[in-house]
Interface confidence: low
Amino acid sequence: FVRTKIDTTENLLNTEVHSSPAQRWSMQVPPEVSAEAGDAAVLPCTFTHPHRHYDGPLTAIWRAGEPYAGPQVFRCAAARGSELCQTALSLHGRFRLLGNPRRNDLSLRVERLALADDRRYFCRVEFAGDVHDRYESRHGVRLHVTAAPRIVNISVLPSPAHAFRALCTAEGEPPPALAWSGPALGNSLAAVRSPREGHGHLVTAELPALTHDGRYTCTAANSLGRSEASVYLFRFHGASGAST
């Protein structure tokens, strides 16, 4: 990510105590928060600043992906003297401020977690009254989302020499183990993990040659659960169909 010259002396694990009036900008966020898909998570963020008794207008911002440049997922603004931070942006309506920015707390609640929410989040506060100042966490908090397996695609495809192959793709965190079962197969573990970048939760398993007609079942399993889907191969009818 782009580095800036903003002073970002952030202490994530241990809040430094600074004696007044030499308080300086700092932000305290944990390295990581973990939760299951479908649940809610709280991203803690507290800060200190050098402007004693500041009660002017302020904006609280959370962004995802990278600091300073990542897309905003939440933004709220508080008028002078107000403890109410009026929400201006909440991506998909799932982000809600839990903390009170007037009390140096920007903690955010994320509802209905999905695997796509598994990324790093950065909190930022901006003062815009008599004092113009801003500060953003540099390394942010990693939201680690876990999920039971879900088979996202199962299909039968033609392969050379009039043969057929089957593909099964599942998502989950931890990435699930995949196994195929079917006619004359027993259990075939043929999982090939996709690269982590961008598709870190997807796993694909291929059956390269389907030798018998019948039902082929893909099972995805991780520590949180399991999921099954099947495809049916009918070569003699000149078609293949899938049923889940």
Epitope: T8, P31, H139, H144
Partner: antibody, heavy 120, light 107 residues
């Protein structure tokens, strides 16, 4: 194969300083948070300090804050722990550990450890 | 800090048997507990995290259970290489804290 090899331990008098090193290999050093964890017969395993990818942020356990400094040199794939104002209770085996990339609060690889004895 | 209490401190068993090691957190840590194995002359090994998820390379005879404050590591059908020290660690919050350890010995 991931390898972490600590060095620099030994016998040191109370109040003096010592610097530990940890040579990392088998992975991209700059992609991981790193840590020092220590173990003594009295206190068992205890987290000492951690450092982020590029050394910008450092984190310390309460018992060493202000006395120990964790640092890293990505060009050398080496982690350091500068220990000053050493006390007898700092006597322990010190392990270099790699933070797991998915769970930043776990240690997925450890070194064999290096012994530090603080005694007069 | 979250206090981690591990029991028993010593355990003797024979190959083929099953054993359980307990770990109790001073406050709720959700499911975020890890187990490590320590053997002389070898680096510590992460076995289980998030209470029950096996780290890659951990044999299936190891299993973890529990949530909140009470957790258990179970080893079924003990193999000779399973003997050694076991530690729990909460990975719910900083500072990261460990249990005091359980020494598993051959009977």
């Amino acid at each position: 194969e991931v390898q972490l090899v600590e060095s620099g331990g030994g016998l040191v008098q109370p109040g003096r300083s010592l610097k530990l090193s940890c040579a990392a290999s088998g992975f991209t050093f700059s992609d991981y948070y790193m840590a020092w964890v220590r173990q003594s017969p009295k206190k068992g395993l205890g987290w000492v300090a951690s450092i982020d990818y590029d050394g910008y942020n450092t984190y310390y356990g309460d018992s060493v804050k202000g006395r120990f400094t964790i640092s890293r040199d990505s060009a050398k794939s080496t982690l350091y722990l500068q220990m000053s104002s050493l006390r007898s209770e700092d006597t322990a085996t010190y392990y270099c550990a790699r933070h797991d990339s998915r769970f930043g609060s776990l240690f997925d690889y450890w070194g064999q450890g290096v012994m530090v004895t603080v005694s007069s | 800090d979250v206090q981690m209490t591990q029991s028993p401190s010593n355990l003797a068993a024979s190959p083929g048997e099953s054993v359980s090691i307990n770990c109790k957190a001073g406050k709720s840590i959700s499911k975020y507990l890890a187990w490590y194995q320590q053997k002389p002359g070898k680096p510590n090994k992460l076995l289980i995290y998030s209470g029950s998820t096996l780290q890659s390379g951990t044999p299936s005879r190891f299993s973890g259970s529990g949530s909140g404050t009470d957790f258990t590591l179970t080893i079924r059908n003990l193999e000779p290489e399973d003997f050694g020290l076991y530690y729990c660690q909460q990975h719910n919050e900083y500072p990261l804290t460990f249990g005091s350890g359980t020494k598993l010995e051959i009977k």
